[in-house]
């Protein structure tokens, strides 16, 4: 819990507490913004981002965005608040410990995005279907 000598200021989104009133730590995420990438046609890729940042607000999670168009491939790594859309999409998988890429519809490019909430989880981005719970075979395994 927040000790009495630490002042909880009004409207302070830097102090986030869980259901027990315990202060929530900020996430540690890879944060290189947009970089050119060689990640293509692979089950998973490393971000090759050497910068690990303390996310500014404790509610933020790690995000990775992979984009491919006619000219290049980029990988974006950031922190972001899952209550807010990113690139106009909701971070629906923000509670996941792994960054499992899901394709999003964007005209003129191939666009994948993932979010996750374990330390530096956006360093390893996963495209493989075997991690995707929309896979019926995996659902069968889960519910057996």
């Amino acid at each position: 819990t927040i000790p009495p000598h630490v002042q909880k200021s009004v409207n302070n989104d830097m102090i986030v507490t869980d259901n027990n009133g315990a202060v929530k730590f900020p996430q540690l995420c890879k944060f290189c913004d947009v970089r050119f990438s060689t990640c293509d046609n692979q089950k998973s890729c490393m971000s090759n981002c050497s910068i690990t940042s303390i996310c500014e607000k404790p509610q933020e999670v790690c995000v990775a965005v992979w984009r491919k168009n006619d000219e290049n491939i980029t990988l974006e790594t950031v922190c972001h608040d899952p209550k807010l859309p990113y690139h106009d999409f909701i971070l629906e998988d923000a509670a996941s410990p792994k960054c499992i890429m899901k394709e999003k519809k964007k005209p003129g490019e191939t666009f994948f995005m993932c979010s996750c909430s374990s330390d530096e989880c956006n360093d390893n981005i996963i495209f493989s279907e075997e991690y995707n719970t929309s896979n019926p075979d995996l659902l069968l395994v889960i519910f057996q």
Epitope: D18, F25, L28, I54
Partner: nanobody
Framework: EVQLLESGGGLVQPGGSLRLSCAAS???????RMWWVRQAPGKGLEWVS?????????YYADSVKGRFTISRDNSKNTLYLQMNSLRAEDTAVYYC?????????????WGQGTLVTVSS
């Protein structure tokens, strides 16, 4: 009983340096990630820096990168924060805190804090 005791704060001119210390006792210091957190007057908490249990990896808020250095001496159960090129906006109470083993929820232990005032 777990105790965290910060020291080293004080009044310093802009551009100056200070070294904060946090003496830890009552727990296995070399097994925990440790943090420096600060709170400016009337403001919220700012997560300044963190260091892994073995000291091999460190993390910094953008606002202090290149100016502050976190370190630890596990043989002395002590956490440090070397603060260089201090600015007025670094004025705050600085707390050390231990991250609990269960992950991201809960500073289970805080120090009482040490006040750093940067002013000419």
């Amino acid at each position: 009983e777990v105790q965290l005791l910060e020291s080293g704060g004080g009044l310093v001119q802009p551009g100056g340096s200070l070294r904060l210390s946090c003496a830890a006792s009552g727990f296995t210091f070399d097994q925990d990630r440790m943090w420096w957190v600060r709170q400016a007057p009337g403001k919220g908490l700012e997560w300044v820096s963190a260091i892994e249990s073995g000291g091999h990896r460190t993390y910094y808020a953008d606002s202090v990168k290149g100016r502050f250095t976190i370190s630890r001496d596990n043989s002395k159960n002590t956490l440090y924060l070397q603060m260089n090129s201090l600015r007025a906006e670094d004025t705050a109470v600085y707390y050390c805190a231990k991250q609990n083993e269960s992950g991201r929820s809960g500073f289970d232990y805080w120090g009482q804090g040490t006040l750093v005032t940067v002013s000419s």
